[in-house]
């Protein structure tokens, strides 16, 4: 047979679906690998073929489209499960071909079990919303294409295991869930259960979104250096260990890159001959403000080291800050008597 352009296993698309729920999976060829869509391919005489490899097996086999109630079917470039079963887990391949052309890609499909509180191994999308912001809406995700617009499904929203009824600042509005002046206590997993009829059967779609309330843009600031500061003097004798923490507070800024670094006499630590160790740690507040600490240490400090200029620098998308550490050599402890 002719050579086939094999795009391999597309692990970027780790598709997870819940057991005993409908699932519609589009062939990734048309979304990520080929320049044309299914309609163009089909009208050009190309055929889309599906097959799969069961979990823990090596053998590729055709998908059985003759199951009772058409449990698995194909419609254009979509593979349908109505509904899924646990043993549908495996690697699925869609192949587009005719007598002269062939292109295929495989992708993993995992059918996941959930408990009555929607706990599962499913990875949930995270929706970040700004604290105290007026209104945030989240929409029940990935339900498009499951039922026609003429069908009005019922939607029930849950926070964790609790149905959202009379929550003071969270209001279910069909497919949307509105948050009014959100607080950190609104953090959590929010689940919509969409129920719709099809051919005399009721199907359920379960979708969960993790809500994380984060600092507001109105509170965003340039980095604030807590340490070093003008109040603390690092007074050492030669031979002692010098330890200077650079502690910087970064308010949450969406997609900001927060940086902290030291310079010694204007140079990066890697560019000086001093034997310096730098250790970094990061902690986060409830609203994802970040405190980043870089500890500069010199095991056995020399008189020259104590004359150097140690500066902590910090940067985020709002600006930059720098602060020099006050380092000096300890006196010998003698004090001359004052003569009048």
């Amino acid at each position: 047979s002719e050579r086939c352009d094999d795009w391999g296993l597309d692990t970027m698309r780790q598709i997870q679906v819940f057991e005993d729920e409908p699932a519609r999976i589009k062939c990734p060829l048309f979304e990520h690998f080929l320049k044309y869509n299914y309609s163009t391919a089909h009208s050009s005489g190309l055929t889309l073929i599906w097959y799969w490899t069961r979990q823990d097996r090596d053998l590729e086999e055709p998908i059985n489209f003759r199951l009772p109630e058409n449990r698995i079917s194909k419609e254009k470039d979509v593979l349908w499960f109505r509904p899924t079963l646990l043993n549908d887990t495996g690697n699925y391949t869609c192949m587009l071909r005719n007598t002269t052309y062939c292109s295929k890609v495989a992708f993993p499909l995992e059918v996941v079990q959930k408990d009555s509180c929607f706990n599962s191994a499913m990875r949930f999308p995270v929706h970040k919303m700004y604290i105290e912001h007026g209104i945030h809406k989240i929409t029940c995700p990935n339900v498009d294409g499951y039922f026609p617009s003429s069908v009005k499904p019922s939607v029930t929203w849950y926070k964790g295991c609790t149905e959202i009824v009379d929550f003071h600042n969270v209001l279910p509005e069909g497919m949307n869930l509105s948050f009014f002046i959100p607080l950190v206590s609104n953090n959590g997993n929010y689940t919509c259960v969409v129920t719709y009829p099809e051919n005399g059967r009721l199907f359920h779609l379960t979708r969960t979104v993790t809500v994380k309330v984060v600092g507001s843009p109105k509170d965003a600031l340039p980095p604030q250096i807590y340490s070093p500061n003008d109040r603390v003097v690092y007074e050492k004798e030669p031979g002692e260990e010098l330890v200077i923490p650079c502690k910087v507070y970064f308010s949450f800024i969406m997609d900001s890159h927060n940086e902290v670094w030291w310079t010694i006499d204007g140079k990066k630590p890697d560019d000086v001959t001093v034997d310096i160790t730098i250790n970094e740690s990061v902690s986060y507040s409830s609203t994802e403000d970040e405190t980043r600490t870089q500890i500069l240490s010199i095991k056995k400090v020399t008189p020259e080291d104590l004359r150097r200029n140690y500066v902590c620098h910090a940067r985020n998308t709002k600006g930059e800050a720098e602060q020099a550490a006050k380092v000096k050599q300890k006196g010998n402890g003698c004090t001359e008597p004052m003569t009048l």
């Epitope: 604290i131 105290e132 003071h168 002046i181």
Partner: antibody, heavy 118, light 107 residues
């Protein structure tokens, strides 16, 4: 210096309406969420309503929901509380206060007395 | 809604003595608890936020502690100007709720 100055209180009959205002100065009003807290004579404090800094989000205590409306005009640095269908139990000193999630109600006005009586 | 319960309702203390006020939440409010002082005819004044952080200009004799459901406001050595009503308030969940208040009076 931060200042919040309420006005608009007074005597009103049951079923009547009143509009309270709160003029803010000394801080960036448009960056501050705000709210109203009331205190019935000889009683404790009761949160009434809140509004987000952008004016889009509003919340109300169950006791006033559907009757009171909070709003703000950031260009005038002013917070409002429109009170309709007033009842005798709405009689109280009404305080406007700035709030932040991190510090709660950190600045308060001096209060304005609303008396609902026939 | 979260119910805040303060105890005692009234606390009689001599000037210079220590006063300890308690506040209990019906469910966890994390550290999102504030304490206010109110004197007759005046607006409340923020003393403590975040359960233990003193607000700007508040003397060091006022301290707050606790997290979750149990909180304490301590006034280490009562001054004459400290005799007032003290309210706790949770701002973890909407609706924000206040305790019924503790009156600190001169013994």
């Amino acid at each position: 210096e931060v200042q919040l100055l309420e006005s608009g209180g007074g005597l009103v009959q049951p079923g009547g309406s009143l509009r309270l205002s709160c003029a803010a100065s000394g801080f960036t009003f448009e960056h501050s969420s705000a709210g109203w807290v009331r205190q019935a004579p000889g009683k404790g404090l009761e949160w009434v309503s809140a509004i987000s800094y952008d004016g889009e989000g509003t919340l109300y205590a169950d006791s006033v929901k559907g009757r009171f409306t909070i709003s703000r005009d950031n260009s005038k640095n002013t917070l409002y509380l429109q009170m309709n269908s007033l009842r005798a139990e709405d009689t109280a000193v009404y305080y406007c206060a700035r709030f932040r999630y991190y510090t709660a109600f950190d600045y308060w006005g001096q209060g304005t007395l609303v008396t609902v009586s026939s | 809604e979260i119910v805040m319960t303060q105890s005692p309702a009234t606390l009689s203390v001599s000037p210079g003595e220590r006063a300890t006020l308690s506040c209990r939440a019906s469910q966890s409010v994390s550290s999102n608890l504030a304490w206010y002082q109110q004197k007759p005819g005046q607006a409340p004044r923020l003393l403590i936020y975040g359960a233990s952080t003193r607000a700007t200009g508040i003397p060091a004799r006022f301290s707050g502690s606790g997290s979750g459901t149990e909180f304490t406001l301590t006034i280490s050595s009562l001054q004459s100007e400290d005799f007032a009503v003290y309210y706790c308030q949770q701002y973890n969940n909407w609706p924000w709720t206040f305790g019924q208040g503790t009156k600190v009076e001169i013994k």
